[in-house]
Structures are given as structure tokens and as C-alpha cells.
């Protein structure tokens, strides 16, 4: 199982039989009327995972996903006709694909779905109390939900649902080219980015939505939006991709005589993740494929993560880059894209700008205006003409924290979970790719928490048949990691100690900050336990130092390689 | 109560237009397709047009296409086709239906007579 | 020419039992569902089957439809006076993207 080496090589593989006969994996192989399980919510208080998916969202047990619910929501044979009608594939386009699945209140959840081209939210009761046991579709209640969900199965829809309101980035009509971010739900009219105008969106693909605080007043809290769009012309040479971060003021209302029913607030940055190339042209990863907030103990300042992949068909390479909400707020308040000069390139606008400075959240924190409704025209003007910021954001240390180009996969979605070793705190990332395995790297610092070192812990096939992986939640309370793709949903442990061996070196060697050996096994590492001594170095993983001799004795050459 | 009402038919010169309204009632216009079928002096029905709730997709039959179009406010709660380089074989009675994976409901027509 | 096949006319007496037929193809009857419309003398037409064999609320259940293969057909049992109408059968022709009608059958109701 364990193999010493190079970083980018695995310390262990296994594959999915090997994953099923040492218990690693349970997985719900779908239904045959199902598929597409794209969808996830994670509750750790009631102990479940709600999973939309085509015609149906279920309700598995984290304990074990064997153990599930389900409530099947088709659409009418009257709405699969018409999408039929309409030259979609009635088995791939013209079913309910579950797109939205947010928690609404104690109560109830909020989804949507793609209705067969025809978008419909409801509401699923849920109780009050895990041990209610409801899940229960509100059949008498369903909303239109163009805005909310798309029309096309293969689009993604970015949502988040806050205080009753749900912003969603999505594309918001059958053909799939008026995509906006939206407010609905709530008691105020419906808030969309500008339609038809390519400086604000230029067919984006939404990722992910998050609320931020930025300051200890909540008037202030933003919505930032993740997402990858066309390049602008001009901004490059060619067709190119890049990866993007939205925001909007949580109290944005739109205008009063412009922009009217429109986010004021809304600007959006680059997201550079790169590495120097020959020539000293840099290779971008510009195909932002999912991001990861890690929380730290400022709420202001969580850690971004982001998986990327290039967008070259010749040289296939995912990376993964970290940002910084500090580095982030600096370019939203450094200076706006423009268009000027004789070839009408963008420059960083060096006019004078309004104040409020737009982008600004109407506050007490950051001067005097209680609404963007009372925002002075020449505020509103400038931000509808100058959405972009020209600076783009790199991520912490310029470069990213690892790539993977020499591999016939690509990288698609990712977790973090924060586990505390021996040696300090640890970042283990879960990587997932397109070919159904999962990644698990651990960030180590090496001189300073900038520079760090990936290793490669393990690399683990979930799913019987390659298949992208789609989405991936980690339970902390349960220990356990859920993944999903088109096929079904799997749920595998966060840590396989034992598996890293019989002797304390190996286990030593590993560098896994889950494991640590206890003397007799490698086991899980608990840093509130009173064990008398747990061998475990995760920064250099250096046994000789760590394990007695009787740990060491004759096993240092003695590795066991699965492929 | 579900009500389709069309208006706009009369006689027409060959190579004349028209335009055809139909103003709906009774339900949720905006989640509808809609659709206009045909029927000449003494024929049979032909489906002419259809349209998607949210305008998105639009189909004709090959004998009108290039020259009807068909589209729909929405906020109005009207259904439009309109009717150009008419023929003498576009002779007909037009009818606006509802459409809900078949024709539901009918309005009562409006004749159209292209004379040469 | 119909896309959809129907025989021009059918008659019964009342209290009999009537079939209309309808046939296709594939790319219509084969692969879509089939909906009957009625079509009372200088009336629009009415929606009376849909998909294949179900009735909208109001009509009466003398009238029921039947598909097999590419074809269908439509009974109406205990024939009444007031039956008397065009019938047509339509689908949605894959094939050609567009809805498709038969010819229609005259339904008369004798004595």
C-alpha cells in the first residue's frame, strides 16, 4: 500500500475494490429512473445529507448513506412533452434536474430544478427536530424559478440563501445566453445584474456563492460570487477564459432612476492562477472549477481556495490556488478597469471617482447614505460603465500551492478540512478529479506558513466506473467525506491509519496529520487525548527521531505498493 | 374559466399581411406554450406554429416559414402571429390553443381569406 | 396528404359502439403520445384523449382511446346523437418538428 518517494506520487492508491474489501467506501450506486447526483447540502446537525438529482432529492444518513430517503419530483408528462417539442433529448434534458437545494429555516429547505426547460422551485418540509424524521415535498405550493435554477441540465447554477433571500448566478432563459446573478425570494422586487452588456457578464459559468462579513456591521456584509466567463475583448489576444470573483452588497436595492431593479454594488476582480512558462510567459489555469472557503477565526477573513484547470486542449494541467479576502478587498479598492486610448485597450482608470466610491456598501461604517436607491447619479453612471476592476488578484505566494500537469485527469472540486497534529495545524485538501478518484494533500509549511510543500498523502478511486466527480462535502463531526457525480454518491472516511502499516516508522513516514502512531498501531490522532507518547512529525516526517528503535527495527525498506 | 379569444382575421390581397392577436384568460398565460393551428374551407386541422412559454424556442410548419412569425407579451397575456407575403392556400379559419403536451384549449378562430 | 392516417368516414347507429383509427409512424404514433379531438359542426375543435388513453375531466367515459405500435384508435361506446362530429386524431412527428393531424372522420349518427 505504501509507497516512500516523490511528493506528486501517492503514499497510497487504492483502488475501488481495494476501497471496498478494507471497508473504506459505502456507496449508493444511484436509481435506474436517477442519475446526475450534482446537488449537495450538508446538515452535520440532523445528520444528514440532502442530494438533488434527476427527478429526485434524497436524504441519506451520514452515519452510512445506505440508509436514505427519497422524494421523487418528476415533471408533468405535459412539460416533458413540450421540452421534447422543443428538440431537447427526453432522457438527458427533458426531466426535473435538481439544480438549488438551500436551507430555507428550520424548518423547510428551498429547491429548484430545471422542470424540463421550464424551472420550478417548491419547499421541502423537513421538521424541526432530527428525530421527526420528515421529508416531505410541499406539492401545493411550487414557484417559477427562472433566475433561480437553469433550463439546461448542463448548466450550473451559483446559490446561496440568506435571511430569506436566495442570490443565485445562473442563465435565466432557454437558450442559455441571458445569464445574470439575481436577489428573488424575500419581500423586495428582484434584483439582477445588467442585462445584454458583456462588461458585466460575458457568458459566465457560476461556481459558487459565499456571504462574507466585512466589517462588524452586518449593513455591510457582501455576496461574492465565483465564476469563469469569456475574456473581454481587448483584454486578451484571442478567445481566452477567466476565472473571476463577483461582489454585491447584501442591502443593495438597486436604483432610483438608473440601474433601477440592478445591482449598484456589483464589481468583479480576476483570479490569477498561474505558473512561469518557457519564454517567460506565464501558464495560466484560467477554467475555475470550484472554490473552498476555509474559516478562520476572523469570519471577515476566511481562506480561498480554488481548483483550476487549463484551458488548452494540447496541455492538460489542474492547479490549485489560495487567496486571501485581504488581497481580494485591495483590489476592489484599487483602481477600475477603462477602456481608452487609440486601440480602446483597458487601462486602469485614472479619472476622478464619485463618492460614495462605488462598490461601497450604504452604511454607518463607510459614510452616509442609507440605501443605493439614494445614491447620486454620477455613482450609479460610474458603475455601470465600470464593473471590472483592473487589477487582478493573486493568490498568497504568487504561484500556486500545487499542479498536476504529468496526468491523464483533471482536477474538478475540493474540500478543506483544518486538523490539528502533533506539530501544529494542518490544511488537508480533498481533491476530486474527472476520472472518480479523490485526492488527500496536506499543506505543509516548510520555513514560513507562505511557503509550502504539498504531499501527496493518498489517491483513492471512489466509484466502480471513472466518472467526474461533481460535488464533495466533509462532515468533521462524522469524520467522513461525500462525493458525487453523475453515477451515484459515495462516502469514504477522512482517514485510513491502519492501512499506512504495521510499524511506527511507516505510519511515521506517512505524514498524515489524521494518524499518529500510539505505540502499538497507527492510529487516529486526538491532540485532547492523554496518550503517553504519540509519534508523529507531519513537517519532515522523519522517524528516526520520532519512533524507538523497536518501531523502526527491519521495516524501513519493507513497502507495500497497490496499483 | 379558461378563455382564448382571437381577432385580426379579414380578407387580404396575395402578398398582403396580417396580424393575428389571441387575448387569454383563466390562467397562467406565462406558463404556457401557446400555438395557432389552421384549418381551410372544408379541411382538415394543420398545426401552423408554436411557441415557448418563456418565447425561448419558436417552431413553424414548413408552409409558413420565412413568412409567419409568432410571438407572445407575456405581461399582456396575448399571443401575436404575424402573417407576411400572403398566399391563397393560407385561406383558413385561425385558431390559438393552449398547449399542455397537446391543444387543451381552443379559441373560436378568426377567418383569414387571401383573394388573387 | 396527412401525415397521420384516418379513414374519411364512420357511422353507427345509437347505443352501438363506434372505432376510429388512426396510424402513423415511428417518429409520430410510435414514439409520441396521441391526442382525439372532437370537432362539433361550426364549433372550434375539443381536446377529448390525451396521451393515448386518458380523458380531460368532463369527458364522458363512453369515449376512450387506444394506442399500439403506430397505430390508434378511439371507441366510442353507447353512441349518442350528439357524437356526431369530425374526429382527429394528432401527434408530435419527432421527425418532422412539428405536430401532426390526420385527415379527420366524419362521424355520423344514423336513424
Known amino acids: 500500500n505504501y509507497q516512500n518517494g516523490k511528493n506528486n506520487v501517492p503514499r497510497l492508491k487504492l483502488s475501488y475494490k481495494e476501497m471496498l474489501e478494507s471497508n473504506n467506501v459505502i456507496t449508493f450506486n444511484g436509481l435506474a429512473n436517477s442519475s446526475s447526483y450534482h446537488t449537495f447540502l450538508l446538515d452535520e446537525e440532523r445528520s444528514r445529507l440532502y442530494v438533488g438529482a434527476k427527478d429526485h432529492i434524497f436524504s441519506f444518513n451520514l452515519v452510512n448513506i445506505k440508509d436514505f430517503q427519497k422524494i421523487v419530483w418528476p415533471v408533468s408528462y405535459t412539460r416533458r412533452d413540450e421540452c421534447k417539442w422543443a428538440g431537447k433529448d427526453i432522457l438527458k434534458e427533458c426531466a426535473n434536474f435538481i439544480k438549488v437545494l438551500k436551507a430555507y429555516n428550520q424548518t423547510h429547505l428551498y429547491a429548484c430544478g430545471t422542470g424540463a426547460f421550464h424551472p420550478i422551485c417548491t419547499y421541502i418540509e423537513i421538521g424541526h427536530h432530527p428525530e421527526d424524521n420528515i421529508f416531505k415535498l410541499e406539492d401545493s405550493h411550487f414557484e417559477n424559478g427562472r433566475g433561480k435554477s437553469p433550463y439546461d441540465p448542463k448548466l450550473l447554477t451559483a446559490s446561496l440563501l440568506i435571511d430569506g433571500e436566495l442570490y443565485s448566478g445562473t442563465a435565466a432563459d432557454f437558450m442559455g445566453r441571458d445569464f445574470a446573478i439575481f436577489r428573488t425570494l424575500g419581500h423586495h422586487h428582484p434584483i439582477r445584474t445588467e442585462q445584454h452588456d458583456s462588461r458585466w457578464l460575458n457568458d459566465p459559468r457560476f461556481i459558487s456563492a459565499h456571504l462574507i462579513p466585512e466589517s462588524d456591521n452586518p449593513e455591510d456584509d457582501k455576496v461574492y460570487f465565483f465564476f469563469r466567463e469569456n475574456a473581454i475583448d481587448g483584454e486578451h489576444t484571442g478567445k481566452a477564459t477567466h476565472a473571476r470573483i463577483g461582489q454585491i452588497c447584501k442591502n443593495d436595492f438597486g436604483g432610483h432612476r438608473s440601474l433601477v431593479n440592478k445591482w449598484t454594488t456589483f464589481l468583479k476582480a480576476r483570479l490569477i492562477c498561474s505558473v512561469p512558462g518557457p519564454n517567460g510567459i506565464d501558464t495560466h489555469f484560467d477554467e475555475l472549477q470550484d472554490v473552498f472557503l476555509m474559516n478562520s477565526k476572523d469570519p471577515k477573513n476566511p481562506v480561498v481556495y480554488g481548483v483550476f484547470t487549463t484551458s488548452s486542449n494540447i496541455f492538460k494541467g489542474s492547479a490549485v490556488c489560495m487567496y486571501s479576502m485581504s488581497d481580494v478587498r485591495r483590489v476592489f479598492l484599487g483602481p477600475y478597469a477603462h477602456r481608452d486610448g487609440p486601440n480602446y485597450q483597458w487601462v486602469p482608470y485614472q479619472g476622478r471617482v464619485p463618492y460614495p466610491r462605488p462598490g461601497t456598501c450604504p452604511s454607518k461604517t463607510f459614510g452616509g447614505f442609507d440605501s443605493t436607491k439614494d445614491l447620486p447619479d454620477d455613482v450609479i453612471t460610474f458603475a455601470r460603465s465600470h464593473p471590472a476592476m483592473y487589477n487582478p488578484v493573486f493568490p498568497i505566494n504568487n504561484r500556486p500551492i500545487m499542479i498536476k500537469t504529468d496526468v491523464n485527469y483533471q482536477f474538478t472540486q475540493i474540500v478543506v478540512d483544518r486538523v490539528d497534529a502533533e506539530d501544529g495545524q494542518y490544511d488537508v485538501m480533498f481533491i476530486g478529479t474527472d476520472v472518480g478518484t479523490v485526492l488527500k494533500v496536506v499543506s505543509i509549511p516548510k520555513e514560513t506558513w507562505h511557503d509550502l510543500e504539498e504531499v501527496l498523502l493518498e489517491e483513492m478511486t471512489v466509484f466502480r466506473e471513472p466518472t467526474t466527480i461533481s460535488a464533495m462535502e466533509l462532515s468533521t463531526k462524522q469524520q467522513q467525506l461525500y462525493v458525487g457525480s453523475a453515477a451515484g454518491v459515495a462516502q469514504l472516511p477522512l482517514h485510513r491509519c491502519d492501512i499506512y502499516g504495521k510499524a511506527c516508522a511507516e505510519c511515521c513516514l506517512a505524514r498524515d496529520p489524521y494518524c499518529a502512531w500510539d505505540g502499538s498501531s497507527c492510529s487516529r490522532y486526538f491532540p485532547t487525548a492523554k496518550a503517553r507518547t504519540r509519534a508523529q512529525d507531519i513537517r519532515n516526517g522523519d522517524p528516526l527521531t520520532h519512533c524507538s528503535d523497536g518501531g523502526i527495527e527491519g521495516r524501513m525498506d519493507h513497502h507495500h505498493h497497490h496499483h | 374559466e379558461v378563455q382564448l379569444l382571437e381577432s385580426g382575421g379579414g380578407l387580404v390581397q396575395t402578398g398582403g399581411s396580417l396580424r393575428l392577436s389571441c387575448a387569454a384568460s383563466?390562467?397562467?398565460?406565462?406558463?404556457?406554450?401557446m400555438s395557432w393551428v389552421r384549418q381551410a374551407p372544408g379541411k382538415g386541422l394543420e398545426w401552423v406554429s408554436w411557441?415557448?412559454?418563456?418565447?425561448?424556442?419558436?417552431y413553424y410548419a414548413d408552409s409558413v416559414k420565412g413568412r409567419f412569425t409568432i410571438s407572445r407579451d407575456n405581461s399582456k397575456n396575448t399571443l401575436y402571429l404575424q402573417m407576411n407575403s400572403l398566399r391563397a392556400e393560407d385561406t383558413a379559419v385561425y385558431y390559438c390553443?393552449?398547449?399542455?403536451?397537446?391543444?387543451?384549449?381552443w379559441g373560436q378562430g378568426t377567418l383569414v381569406t387571401v383573394s388573387s | 396528404q396527412s401525415v397521420l392516417t384516418q379513414p374519411p368516414s364512420a357511422s353507427g347507429t345509437p347505443g352501438q359502439r363506434v372505432t376510429i383509427s388512426c396510424s402513423g409512424s415511428?417518429?409520430?404514433?410510435?414514439?409520441?403520445?396521441v391526442s382525439w379531438y372532437q370537432q362539433l359542426p361550426g364549433t372550434a375543435p375539443k381536446l377529448l384523449i390525451y396521451?393515448?388513453?386518458h380523458r380531460p375531466s368532463g369527458v364522458p367515459d363512453r369515449f376512450s382511446g387506444s394506442k399500439s405500435g403506430t397505430s390508434a384508435s378511439l371507441a366510442i361506446s353507447g353512441l349518442r346523437s350528439e357524437d356526431e362530429a369530425d374526429y382527429y386524431c394528432?401527434?408530435?412527428?419527432?421527425?418532422?418538428?412539428?405536430?401532426?393531424f390526420g385527415g379527420g372522420t366524419k362521424l355520423t349518427v344514423l336513424g
Open positions: 415511428s417518429s409520430n404514433i410510435g414514439n409520441n403520445d
Open positions: 383563466g390562467f397562467t398565460f406565462s406558463d404556457y406554450a
Open positions: 411557441i415557448y412559454y418563456d418565447s425561448g424556442s419558436k
Open positions: 390553443a393552449k398547449l399542455n403536451g397537446d391543444f387543451d384549449y
Open positions: 394528432g401527434a408530435w412527428d419527432s421527425s418532422l418538428s412539428g405536430y401532426v
Open positions: 396521451a393515448d388513453s
